[in-house]
């Protein structure tokens, strides 16, 4: 049968800067097609048990599936198909009109990048290593991308970079951070991750395979334009503040949905990973920029109104984002009580 469980079935995830998440496209007959989220009798804003797509994630060399549901961006020029029958079956599909199709998105866990453990520093008689220097961002939680502790490798030597009080004092322009994010193909620099986020933030119960490397480097030239001139070797040590960055290309991004009687209005729910939860009202939520973005993600028209619902219940829990826009949120913070839900109305493009 023609299904995504067939070992020869070709899928790809597009419209994202991560190969393990994006809009699902499938190859059938003579070309690639975008799959509509209304396929297999689902409604366009319904979320599925992601485990049903585990074979897809596996074949893409990604980790376990985290989410399967509507994707935010559509390419109107692409072949779009709606399929029928059992979820993941492509035996019976029809081409869909441009206006009715909402793409299906899939997020798989990013595989942990494993780096061979660095060897001991060579004896002083050995000539300097000649392999090109390289950088790596080591995320503390599996599947994170473009956020974490910076590791610098030069030849056989690899380690983290010291980032102490004096570096912070001199570091006003953040030229180095932008250069590092850009060298890592992670966009531009957003913020420094505090030590707690960088060195200890782990998903509960998750053991990190990649143990932190010792500090081997310090910043030599913060306006460097090639990696070999940025850092200098120091005597290795195992404690101290290290350079940890969050770049604009971080993944996974926060996803939002509106839960209500129509696609374009309802209480806002968010997730970053597997679990949906209510978005709590906060001072940063006052900006219309946040809600414009939410409306856009639902593929609705412009933002109409937002209303914070009464949080009389001390047990009401949710997630909040300290930034103006949800797309800037690297980590949602959990609110265990008095979470004021938010009701947003967007313009319905098809009233």
């Amino acid at each position: 049968r023609l299904s995504w469980d067939d070992p020869d079935f070709q899928t790809r995830l597009t419209r994202s800067n991560s190969r393990c998440q994006g809009q699902l496209e499938v190859y059938i007959k003579y070309g690639w097609h975008m799959v509509c989220s209304q396929s297999w009798g689902r409604s366009s804003n319904q979320w599925e048990d992601p485990n049903q797509a585990s074979k897809v994630c596996q074949r893409l060399n990604c980790g376990v599936p985290l989410s399967l549901g509507p994707f935010l961006i559509t390419d109107r020029h692409q072949s779009q198909i709606t399929c029928y029958g059992r979820l993941g079956s492509f035996s019976n599909c029809s081409h869909s009109g441009r206006d009715v199709c909402r793409p299906l998105g899939l997020t798989c866990l990013e595989p942990q990048t494993t780096t061979p453990p660095p060897t001991r520093p060579p004896p002083t008689t050995t000539p300097e290593p000649t392999a090109p220097p390289r950088l790596q961002l080591v995320a503390q939680a599996a599947g994170r991308h473009c956020a974490g502790v910076v590791e610098f490798y030069s030849g056989s030597l690899g380690g983290t970079i010291s980032y102490e009080a004096q570096d912070k004092a001199q570091d006003k322009t953040q030229v180095l951070e932008n250069f590092l994010c850009s060298s890592l193909q992670c966009g531009s620099f957003l913020k420094h991750l505090p030590e707690t986020e960088a060195a200890t933030a782990q998903d509960p119960g998750e053991l990190r395979e990649h143990q932190p490397l010792p500090i081997q480097w310090t910043i030599r030239n913060s306006s460097c334009t090639s990696l070999e001139h940025c850092f200098q070797k120091i005597k290795p040590r195992n404690s101290g503040q290290v350079l940890a960055l969050l770049c604009s290309g971080f993944q996974p991004k926060v996803q939002s949905r509106l839960v209500g009687s129509s696609i374009c209005e309802g209480t806002v729910e968010v997730r970053q990973g597997a679990q949906w939860a209510a978005l709590c009202d906060s001072s940063s939520a006052k900006s219309s920029l946040r809600w414009e973005e939410v409306c856009r993600e639902q593929q609705c028209g412009s933002f109409n109104s937002y209303q914070a619902l009464d949080a009389g219940d001390p047990t009401s829990r949710g997630l909040s984002c300290p930034h103006q826009k949800l797309s800037q949120c690297h980590e949602l913070t959990e609110r265990k009580s008095y979470c004021k839900k938010v009701f947003v109305t967007c313009q319905d493009p098809n009233p």
Partner: antibody, heavy 120, light 106 residues
């Protein structure tokens, strides 16, 4: 095991219509994802894809020959047919019947070919 | 129509050699490329599909590589039975074949 066998008239005159039949076994065109098509090869030259028909009756034609070609199937009899109208001497070639799955695994099985000569 | 160009009509090799047959697409075809072997008087046989996946029963001395517009079929440790015509095929948009490369003995 999968086999495909072509049959055709052998010799025709210019402007006539060619009718080819492909009889296959070892798979069914009622199975989703299955397709059968036609490819030709003039003697000592390259391969040219002509047409393809799928399990769901979806058909694809080579855009440069579309107006001359008609492909059809009888899934219950395990047969696929190709008609080429308004023949020309340039249509002299060996015609192959091929199987291809919708997952894009290439033309995985080929018939032995039937030779057509178009001559006045 | 996407044009597939096999720039070498003929390639000479010796038994035990390694040979690479090139194929270039006129536009990006992703990895939707297959390779076929055809011996005189026989039908073509599928060797490789999706650029690098070997068809059932194909010896592992045949490997495919590439993506986008440039593709290569490599035969390591060439055997006398490998002397044949080789065709590349794109199926990203309809189907088009390369004109073929004949592998012959030096």
């Amino acid at each position: 095991q999968v086999t495909l066998k072509e049959s055709g008239p052998g010799i025709l005159k210019p402007s006539q219509t060619l009718s080819l039949t492909c009889s296959f076994s070892g798979f069914s065109l009622s199975t989703s994802g299955m397709g059968v098509g036609w490819i030709r090869q003039p003697s000592g030259k390259g391969l040219e894809w002509l047409a393809h028909i799928w399990w769901d009756d979806d058909v694809y034609y080579n855009p440069s020959l579309k107006n001359q070609l008609t492909i059809s199937k009888d899934a219950s009899r395990d047969q696929v047919f190709l008609k080429i109208t308004n023949l020309d001497t340039a249509d002299t070639a060996t015609y192959y019947c091929v199987r291809r799955r919708a997952t894009g695994t290439g033309f995985d099985y080929w018939g032995q070919g039937t030779t057509l000569t178009v001559s006045s | 129509n996407i044009v597939m160009t096999q720039s070498h009509k003929f390639m000479s090799t010796s038994v035990g050699d390694r040979v690479s047959i090139a194929c270039k697409a006129s536009q990006d075809v992703g990895t939707a490329v297959a390779w076929y072997q055809q011996k005189p008087g026989q039908s073509p046989k599928l060797l490789i599909y999706w650029t690098s996946t070997r068809h059932t029963g194909v010896p592992d001395r045949f490997t495919g590589s590439g993506s986008g517009t440039d593709f290569t079929l490599t035969i390591t440790n060439v055997q006398s039975e490998d002397l044949a015509d080789y065709f590349c095929h794109q199926y990203n948009s309809y189907n088009t074949f390369g004109s073929g490369t004949r592998l012959e003995l030096k």
